[in-house]
């Protein structure tokens, strides 16, 4: 039987799981307050890898520490458009293999859509997400997510896959996002950024997190991964932010330590089993959810995301450790690794909680709150 | 469906040499790394080398000098030429493919192909 996580499980790395409500829905701006590019550019749209920076050009800055207390919206910058400094970017030179349009990278060329032409789909991802546009959808209950504490035997594997950090998850890892809704974790991975850049894929009002981590999930209707490419809910992936805190996350310190020995690409280590759950928010019943695309090439539609409400917190030194350790193809850092916002072309965002809900005094007029479209209401 | 086909084994006179070849096919293949692996009888499968797309080249100490791995990424094929082959190189020979496909690598495995080092 599947339960869904406590509210009172312990907090990761000793009390640093992350705010209850960083993207807390008090005293929000209203729509005319906070203009944005509506579309950002595609991956086609990007400069080439001449006219981005490279690590050179970096500060050296570390990150700023949130202040303490709840993180509000009213707080983050309301436009970062994608072509800003913060613009994903590969640092990495041509592969010897120049002309080959087959591979992908971030920034540059070849453009996304030759690769695969699904990333020039209408309902790509990531996305923006404005918690006043959601959806408040009862009928979205607490995530259920049963086997992700892993003995330490047997190990498994991480590996520099030249695009991320990957760690491959055994058999026996089961999510449930409601009745009916199953699916088996395969791997996971992060996004992050450079020294004083942030780097996560998906964004709040505009604010792009120090990075992101991506539990990829099959649905059980499929038995292998390349059958569910572009069937609706044939995969889903839990999304969650991570922050600077305080402390050290001691469930990220078992894998941030072991980056070192696969700073080169194409490199492994097998690193004993952990508490997958506790690499991810203690609030498994606060979330939002919409259906998009793989984030990577061959960006494959159909997929539910569910991206968490609380964060997760990391010390500066281990968000460093990410953002600074590993290596990608042709003596590049591995940086910078995510994907511009994409439109989300009509599609309306889901909230499992009343995210839109806006109890300011400031507000002129009444919120304007899209219906809930989820089945089952 | 994505396809893996091994081909070049065979028996072979010690101090000689095979080429291996795998040939991947299926629709629209996004192939990050590729490697070989073995398994010799009553033993655990082993690497022998890898390749990522940008070219760069992993051995296991046992056959450094004697093997080289290679990769043609316009044909999606994975080589491996074995030289000064030795009767410990005795082993069913496996093609891996680590397939970009979910956001990150997927394994998949060829059938695998027997190389028999005897005089």
């Known amino acids: 039987q599947r339960l869904p996580r406590m509210q009172e499980d312990s907090p990761l790395g000793g009390g640093s799981s992350g705010e209850d409500d960083p993207l807390g829905e008090e005293d929000l701006p209203s729509e005319e307050d906070s203009p944005r590019e509506e579309d950002p550019p595609g991956e086609e749209d990007l400069p080439g890898e001449e006219d981005l920076p490279g690590e050179e050009d970096l500060p050296e800055v570390k990150p700023k520490s949130e202040e303490e207390g709840s993180l509000k919206l009213e707080d983050l910058p309301t436009v970062e458009a994608p072509g800003d400094p913060q613009e994903p970017q590969n640092n990495a030179h041509r592969d010897k293999e120049g002309d080959d349009q087959s591979h992908w990278r971030y920034g540059g060329d070849p453009p996304w859509p030759r690769v695969s032409p699904a990333c020039a789909g209408r309902f790509q991802s990531p996305v923006d997400i404005r918690p006043q546009l959601a959806a408040f959808c009862p009928a979205l209950r607490p995530l259920e997510l049963l086997g992700f504490q892993l003995p330490p035997l047997p190990e498994l594997r991480l590996r520099n896959n030249g695009h991320s950090v990957q760690l491959t998850l055994p058999p026996g890892l089961e999510m449930a996002l409601g009745p009916g809704r199953e699916y088996r974790a395969l791997q996971l991975h992060l996004h992050w950024g450079a020294a004083g850049r942030p780097g996560s894929e998906h964004t709040v009002e505009g604010h792009r997190f120090p990075a992101e981590i991506h539990v990829v999930h099959l649905s059980t209707a499929f038995a292998r991964v390349d059958e569910a490419l572009g069937r609706p809910g044939g995969l889903a992936v839990l999304a969650a932010f991570l922050e600077e805190g305080p402390e050290e996350n001691s469930a990220y310190e078992q894998l941030l330590s072991r980056l070192e020995e696969i700073a080169e690409e194409g490199s492994e280590t097998q690193v004993p089993g952990l508490d997958i759950s506790a690499l991810l928010p203690s609030d498994f019943s606060r979330y939002f959810q919409y259906e998009g695309s793989l984030t990577t090439p061959p960006c494959a539609q159909g997929v539910i995301w569910t991206v968490f409400n609380q964060t997760v917190m990391l010390s500066a030194k281990q968000l460093h450790t990410l953002s600074d350790t590993l290596w990608g193809p042709g003596d590049s850092r591995l940086q910078l690794n995510f994907r511009a916002t994409q439109p989300l072309n009509g599609r309306v965002i889901e909230a499992s909680f009343p995210a839109g809900v806006d109890s300011s005094p400031r507000a002129a007029e009444p919120v304007q709150l899209n219906s809930c479209l989820a089945a089952g209401d | 469906q994505v396809q893996l086909v091994e081909s070049g084994g065979g028996l072979v006179q010690p101090g000689g040499s095979l080429r291996l070849s795998c040939a991947a096919s299926?629709?629209?293949?996004?192939?990050?790394?590729m490697g070989w692996y073995r398994q010799a009888p009553g033993k655990q499968r082993e690497l022998v080398a890898t390749?990522?797309?940008?070219?760069?080249?992993n051995y296991a100490d046992s056959v450094k000098g004697r093997f080289t791995i290679s990769r043609d990424n316009s044909k999606n094929t994975l080589y491996l030429q074995m030289n000064s082959l030795r009767a410990e190189d005795t082993a069913v020979y496996y093609c891996?493919?680590?397939?970009?496909?979910?956001?990150?690598?997927?394994?998949?495995w060829g059938q695998g192909t027997l190389v028999t080092v005897s005089s």
């Open positions: 299926g629709s629209a293949l996004i192939i990050n790394a």
């Open positions: 891996n493919v680590a397939l970009w496909i979910a956001d990150g690598e997927y394994d998949y």
């Open positions: 390749v990522t797309r940008s070219g760069r080249t």
